[in-house]
Amino acid sequence: AWELTILHTNDVHSRLEQTSEDSSKCVNASRCMGGVARLFTKVQQIRRAEPNVLLLDAGDQYQGTIWFTVYKGAEVAHFMNALRYDAMALGNHEFDNGVEGLIEPLLKEAKFPILSANIKAKGPLASQISGLYLPYKVLPVGDEVVGIVGYTSKETPFLSNPGTNLVFEDEITALQPEVDKLKTLNVNKIIALGHSGFEMDKLIAQKVRGVDVVVGGHSNTFLYTGNPPSKEVPAGKYPFIVTSDDGRKVPVVQAYAFGKYLGYLKIEFDERGNVISSHGNPILLNSSIPEDPSIKADINKWRIKLDNYSTQELGKTIVYLDGSSQSCRFRECNMGNLICDAMINNNLRHTDEMFWNHVSMCILNGGGIRSPIDERNNGTITWENLAAVLPFGGTFDLVQLKGSTLKKAFEHSVHRYGQSTGEFLQVGGIHVVYDLSRKPGDRVVKLDVLCTKCRVPSYDPLKMDEVYKVILPNFLANGGDGFQMIKDELLRHDSGDQDINVVSTYISKMKVIYPAVEGRIKFSTGSH
């Protein structure tokens, strides 16, 4: 028998520095977790203790903190090289700055193979990107070889900016011939490493003949066997065992997100490359694991540029940006409008001639807007200003909801109106009218939404049975502020870009902003 240790991360999302337990900014260092310096300590410890070790990343290193905003992926290549990653699969967020923003900082600088079997380049890009990412790689490990085959969510064109010269194929259809190719090369130990979410990971384990292990990402899935060590609730045991169509037991793993855990999976293969056993658990990277001093010193060196960036002007406002709780938790506020407009702008993807865009709607809990910005400071808006407005380090995500769920959400928005509670929704691409004289749960008297399948966008009444795409904070997607109906009834959820980054990009693009209160949210009494 031959034993392999797979160490894996996914959805690190720019958390190069240690973070608090909820993966936001580290405040009390003695209670902080993750970060590349701590990760390196643990990885090195395992490499020294065990013979056949692979360190793999299942995508979405890009996007999530000011590190990515400033360094645009160069930080990913630098620190992943420093940690000696063995391979990485492309995630959807790796395309956030377009193909060029992937090629130059990451693909050309990475000293490890970057993989995806279901992304096919065409046109002039094909030669430009040739060899910079691969469908699979045969990695020598000890005196054996292991085949790693990559995959990426086929939804990427809707979630990011891969452009028109990359085709995202069905994962299973694309993976099978590559695995077959590995088999003809007598590679009998094959890992599928990719970024399509836990459901697809399980399908790959079930359907792709020859795949021995699946290491996934995208859905931030936490798996654990035994008592979990932190706040995350396991979605299943680690590894999650799938019985393939040809009768094999295939371990599937994922390691939550944000570099909080290091996935640790030990696999035993027989001489024919069959998995005999698999066991392990994610390792919580808490403060009991010291940060490696040389990596930490490097982090501090790179940090300097971030501190300078946060005080630079992004753009100007010529109006007061009202982000006060007195406004945003009671009525339409122009800061809410600004943020929602930025959220929609960030999701402009012309992927279909029938649609002017794939999504037109935004909702945003007023309680998530934490500060106004005064225009009387020469109109200057900095990252620092925006960090005061959006201090929680969240993301603006894409969900699919039925109209009936949206209606429930808007009822929840005003079910206890007047108490300055955070659930009052700010909106974009939506016109809502409330009648507060009616009983809670029946206060939405008009709800019109901006069409997407139209050449001239206009507002139409919400249809209860129709499925709509909506951009919202991850906080709401996860049922925060009492929006349990969103969490329970959402049909799809894809995590998006860092909230501050979305707004800062929009302000930089617009240069001068002047958001108004324009009647998106209205109150009425009486009949309609």
Partner: antibody, heavy 122, light 110 residues
Framework: QLQLVESGGGLVQPGRSLRLSCAAS????????MHWVRQAPGKGLEWVSG????????GYADSVKGRFTISRDNAKNSLYLQMNSLRAEDTALYYC???????????????WGQGTMVTVSS | QSVLTQPPSASGTPGQRVTIPCSGS????????VYWYQQFPGTAPKLLIY???QRPSGVPDRFSGSKSGTSASLAIAGLRSEDEADYYC???????????FGTGTKLTVL
């Protein structure tokens, strides 16, 4: 400056052993995979063996498998090639080369030594 | 014997553009990167192109690499007398599980 210096070559009888060394300087040695490449007189280049940054992955050309052993000592910035059961066809100039990657030695060789000559003859 | 095939010789006059082909298979060029080396008599090889088309710093942009399917080629534009050398393509081969060099091409500048 970046430098690789090979040593240990010489004339040896068939069936005997030889150990080649390569001393590295001017770069962080344990950041990179390292290789041995040989060139028989008047012939082309042939990859002999490679070793990853932490010795976690090791590979050999079929022609030397079971006879040659590659190793490295990162503390000493040194690469080694232990050559046993030498044959006449192992006669060549042996180069030490640095990879541009650290991993499973499938990168490019961007720094080469000047080589050490191994002659296997009775 | 080498699994990457190159013509034994190529030639051109100063200023001309010459192309040196390298033919492989799906287990090497087909799925892995191609590298090119230049070697002058009596000296160690020098890396010219890595990852199919990238040039290390210091290599003139007269040298360019390309890859299509299981074949690759090195193009030298504006040929100069100092380009006279041996040129080798190379890359990892998943089948033999090793690094393979091409047979080498001797370039003569007429």
């Amino acid at each position: 400056q970046l430098q690789l210096v090979e040593s240990g070559g010489g004339l040896v009888q068939p069936g005997r052993s030889l150990r080649l060394s390569c001393a590295a300087s001017g770069f962080t040695f344990d950041d990179y995979a390292m290789h041995w490449v040989r060139q028989a007189p008047g012939k082309g280049l042939e990859w002999v063996s490679g070793i990853s940054w932490n010795s976690g992955s090791i590979g050999y050309a079929d022609s030397v498998k079971g006879r040659f052993t590659i190793s490295r000592d990162n503390a000493k910035n040194s690469l080694y090639l232990q050559m046993n059961s030498l044959r006449a066809e192992d006669t060549a100039l042996y180069y030490c080369a640095k990879d541009i990657w650290y991993g499973g030695f499938f990168g490019a060789f961007d720094i080469w030594g000047q080589g050490t000559m191994v002659t296997v003859s009775s | 014997q080498s699994v990457l095939t190159q013509p034994p010789s190529a030639s051109g006059t100063p200023g001309q553009r010459v192309t040196i082909p390298c033919s492989g298979s799906s287990s090497n060029i087909g799925t892995n990167s191609v590298y090119w080396y230049q070697q002058f008599p009596g000296t160690a090889p020098k890396l010219l192109i890595y990852r199919n088309f990238q040039r290390p710093s210091g290599v003139p942009d007269r040298f360019s690499g390309s890859k299509s399917g299981t074949s690759a080629s090195l193009a030298i534009a504006g040929l100069r007398s100092e380009d006279e050398a041996d040129y080798y393509c190379a890359g990892w081969d998943d089948s033999v599980r090793g690094y393979v060099f091409g047979t080498g091409t001797k370039l003569t500048v007429l």
